[in-house]
């Protein structure tokens, strides 16, 4: 499957509003720093197949989505950034989607990647436990917002991978 | 490949200012924290700024504060430290250094360093 | 501000065997998130300083794995397990933990 020419363009839209997304200084937050223990080994170079690949970009960007559209996020973030932060995640779910049925096809249940998506998604749970944790803070955003750039590069490296295998 | 040219250094009169850049090349240089940081000629090194990916939010360590400035422009990719009211301790190699993406545990490794560029403050 | 304390020099090594060079902190770079937020840089002579070991005990990208780092939060060692002449130079540990960010003097080491 070929993931349209706007889906990179749509990838670096979403890092820049990330980016635009911060609302006070990291240096002042370094108390507040956290290991969310991203898991960085279901985005190796693994023997990956490709549709295992997608999967777990689609479950990263869902994920991510999620995040982004509670209303605690609302409250916290810059409403107008984030309305076309959805606009962009959006597309790359459809285009997501798109391949996942080119690739995996019906017969093939995406339970088989199971154990990459739970990952991914105990991840994400440990993120929504700090926020709680820490009341939703600007500090507790900032840092969220830092590791979800982070991880959000890890997503679109793993993307110019596959592209650069097919 | 990974590059950090610099250019800038010069011998200065005390009091007189001084205008560091570092270019980058062989990576997204907007994505990226940047640091200046010092070697004295003892060879002790000493952390003179930084600046976020954006260039919104800067940290300077008091020894430099309201004298030195650090800045960037990410669409020439290049780090700047402007210096102003120098003193003698503010001669020193610089380097401009990366920071490597640390995601939400903040860390501030220095990754990529540049080659230096020398300052000599001295009448 | 947090100080870094090392060594003017290490203990003269032969080439082949073990070297270790200290450095110690004046307050815990054990951080609540359980890391320790202790780098290694190592400057060779006539060279920019190059990272060998972030967050205490994580080599860096193409470091070699004779280079291995521990510590307890406020002391900590850096070993080359079998050192070679490309490893002179002079070892500098910093600290990331608080700002601002501090570095030690720097550790020469020494060969036979």
């Known amino acids: 499957c070929d993931l349209p020419q706007t889906h990179s363009l749509g990838n670096r839209r979403a890092l820049i509003l990330l980016a635009q997304m911060r609302r006070i200084s990291p240096f002042s937050c370094l108390k507040d720093r956290h290991d969310f223990e991203f898991p960085q080994e279901e985005f190796d170079d693994k023997q990956f197949q490709k549709a295992q690949a997608i999967s777990v970009l689609h479950e990263m960007i869902q994920q991510t989505f999620n995040l982004f559209s509670t209303k605690d996020s609302s409250a916290a973030l810059d409403e107008t950034l984030l309305d076309e932060f959805y606009i962009e995640l959006d597309q790359q779910l459809n285009d997501l989607e798109s391949c996942v049925m080119q690739e995996v096809g019906v017969i093939e249940s995406p339970l088989m990647y199971e154990d990459s998506i739970l990952a991914v998604r105990k991840y994400f749970q440990r993120i929504t436990l700090y926020l709680t944790e820490k009341k939703y803070s600007s500090c507790a955003w900032e840092v969220v917002r830092a590791e979800i750039m982070r991880s959000f590069s890890l997503s679109i490296n793993l993307q110019k991978r596959l592209k650069s295998k097919e | 490949e990974v590059q950090l040219q610099q250019s800038g250094g010069d011998l200065v009169k005390p009091g007189g200012s001084l205008k560091l850049s570092c270019a980058a090349s062989?990576?997204?240089?907007?994505?990226?924290?940047m640091s200046w940081v010092r070697q004295t000629p003892d060879k002790r090194l000493d952390w003179v700024s930084i600046i976020t990916s954006g260039g919104s939010y800067t940290y300077y360590p008091d020894s430099v504060k309201g004298r030195f400035t650090i800045s960037r422009d990410n669409a020439k990719n290049t780090l700047y430290l402007q210096m102003s009211s120098l003193k003698s301790e503010d001669t020193a190699m610089y380097y401009c250094?990366?920071?490597?993406?640390?995601?939400?545990?903040?860390?501030?490794?220095?990754?990529?360093w540049g080659q230096g560029t020398s300052v000599t403050v001295s009448s | 501000d947090i100080v870094m304390t090392q060594a003017a020099f290490s203990n003269p090594v032969t080439l082949g065997t073990s070297a270790s060079i200290s450095c110690r902190s004046s307050?815990?770079?054990?951080?609540?998130?359980?890391?320790?937020?202790l780098y290694w840089y190592l400057q060779k002579p006539g060279q920019s300083p190059q990272l060998l070991i972030y967050?205490?005990?994580n080599l860096a990208s193409g470091v070699p794995d004779r280079f291995s780092s521990s510590g307890s939060g406020i002391d900590f060692t850096l070993r080359i397990s079998r050192v070679e002449a490309e490893d002179v130079g002079a070892y500098y540990c910093a600290q990331n933990l608080e700002l601002p960010f501090t570095f030690g003097s720097g550790t020469k080491l020494e060969i036979k």
């Open positions: 967050q205490m005990s």
């Open positions: 062989g990576f997204t240089f907007s994505s990226y924290g």
């Open positions: 307050k815990s770079l054990l951080h609540s998130n359980g890391i320790t937020y």
């Open positions: 250094a990366r920071h490597a993406e640390g995601g939400g545990n903040y860390d501030y490794a220095m990754d990529y």
